[in-house]
């Protein structure tokens, strides 16, 4: 079996984690993706996801978590907020293929949120959830989610697809060239 | 359409290994879904005991994560579990399933597809 | 492991009554919540997932609400085929997934 990677970012609490993660095939531009969380010893958790299919350019916000599929750079930009300590974790960005696994895209990230502000250049002190507030109309909540303690969610909608026949199926095969850059405001 | 069906010894002795064998058709088990097992002793509820993905990643119920091994036999569209050092609680119909996970899945999760279930009892 | 309790264990109706059936979780599971049917000797049916998405060729007499830790189980018009035992389940901690103790639906 492939060893999973990790890789570490440490912020302070009020930084914002941005993440880019490029799946540059175009195949996979419209494509359901999600950003999760990975408990110790548990299934991961859906924390947002795009819609489906993903829209271009289309923000979707879910608490203090931001989605936003860019199909012409072949990214998914995920950026988490006004950081808290208790944020500290594991995490990954996944294309959606059910009913086959989520295909994961790049290193894990494990994030780690300390107390207090570095002061550093870039550092984005300020980052409230207010500096990233979208407006109404395109705040969505569109996957069962995972509610933690400072991340208000909303219930997904009524499905009334019934994807639990292969037809839904997407085939991920020979996903090449995957790099993922790591953006700090 | 999809069918599991179970197979196995029904009577195993106390401080044995159980073991149990879940052929599912109409679905080629190296399409996706989790493939699980579940328990009912007699009447009482519903025990999920673990399941496997194709590739061989598995999820346990931590109760029993000690004594359970569930493998997967992708050329023979097939799935089976080894419950070690049983004891007269490990008495049950066992059920294999079809799984699919929420974090898999956006817009449907749950057990969609059962076998008919197997009785095992545990006595000497 | 999140523990959840169903509510009744048992209860009694009538064809065409309508019935309740609820299942608390010891803590919040957002809406990780399904629903199944278990007749005697018969493996167990789904019915709603993801506490109120009917399954495909379920009847629309089903219906499921609820979230955090309260959920809602209704059949608006009790058929003679869902005489049954009612089981919740989360999938929300997991492992282990869960299931409630189940509330066995009697003829009255």
């Known amino acids: 079996a492939t060893k999973l990677t990790e890789e570490k970012y440490e912020l302070k609490e009020g930084q914002t984690l941005d993440v880019k993660c490029d799946y540059t095939l175009e195949k996979f531009a419209s494509s359901q993706k999600a950003w999760q969380i990975i408990r110790d010893g548990e299934m991961p958790k859906t924390l947002a996801c795009t819609e489906r299919p993903s829209k271009n350019s289309h923000p979707v916000q879910v608490g203090r978590i931001i989605l936003e599929d860019y199909h012409d750079h072949g990214l998914l930009r995920v950026r988490m907020v006004n950081l808290q300590v208790e944020d500290s974790g594991l995490y990954q960005c996944v294309i959606y293929q059910p009913p086959k696994e989520p295909h994961m895209l790049f290193d894990r990230i494990r994030l780690v949120v300390t107390k207090g502000f570095s002061g550093t250049p870039g550092s984005n002190e300020n980052s409230t959830q207010n500096v990233y507030k979208i407006p109404p109309t395109t705040t969505k909540a569109l996957c069962p989610l995972y509610t933690s303690p400072r991340t208000v969610t909303q219930a997904p909608p009524k499905s009334t697809a019934d994807v639990s026949t292969p037809d839904s199926e997407i085939n991920l095969t020979n996903v090449t060239d995957i790099i993922r850059v790591p953006v700090f405001n | 359409q999809v069918q599991l069906q179970e197979s196995g010894p029904g009577l195993v002795k106390p401080s044995e290994t159980l073991s149990l064998t879940c052929a599912v058709s109409?679905?080629?088990?190296?399409?996706?879904?989790?493939w699980g097992w579940i328990r009912q002793p007699p009447g009482k509820g519903l025990e999920w005991i673990g399941s496997i993905y194709h590739s061989g990643n598995t999820y346990y119920n931590p109760s029993l994560k000690s004594r359970v091994t569930i493998s997967v036999d992708t050329s023979k569209n097939q799935f089976s579990l080894k419950l070690s050092s049983v004891t007269a609680a490990d008495t049950a119909v066992y059920y294999c399933?079809?799984?699919?996970?929420?974090?898999?899945?956006?817009?449907?999760?749950?057990?969609?597809?059962w076998g008919r279930g197997t009785t095992v009892t545990v006595s000497s | 492991d999140i523990q959840m309790t169903q509510s009744p264990s048992s209860l009694s109706a009538s064809v065409g009554d309508r019935v309740t059936i609820t299942c608390r979780a010891s803590q919040s599971i957002s809406r990780y919540l399904n629903w199944y049917q278990q007749k005697p000797g018969k493996a167990p049916k789904l019915l709603i997932y993801?506490?109120?998405s009917l399954q495909s060729g379920v009847p629309s007499r089903f219906s499921g609400s609820g979230s955090g830790t309260d959920f809602t189980l209704t059949i608006s018009s009790l058929q003679p085929e869902d005489f049954a035992t009612y089981y919740c389940?989360?999938?929300?901690?997991?492992?282990?997934?869960?299931f409630g103790g189940g509330t066995k639906v009697e003829i009255k």
């Open positions: 399933a079809r799984e699919l996970y929420a974090y898999s899945s956006p817009m449907f999760y749950g057990m969609d597809v």
């Open positions: 109409g679905y080629s088990i190296s399409s996706g879904y989790y």
């Open positions: 993801a506490a109120s």
């Open positions: 389940q989360q999938l929300y901690h997991a492992p282990p997934i869960t």
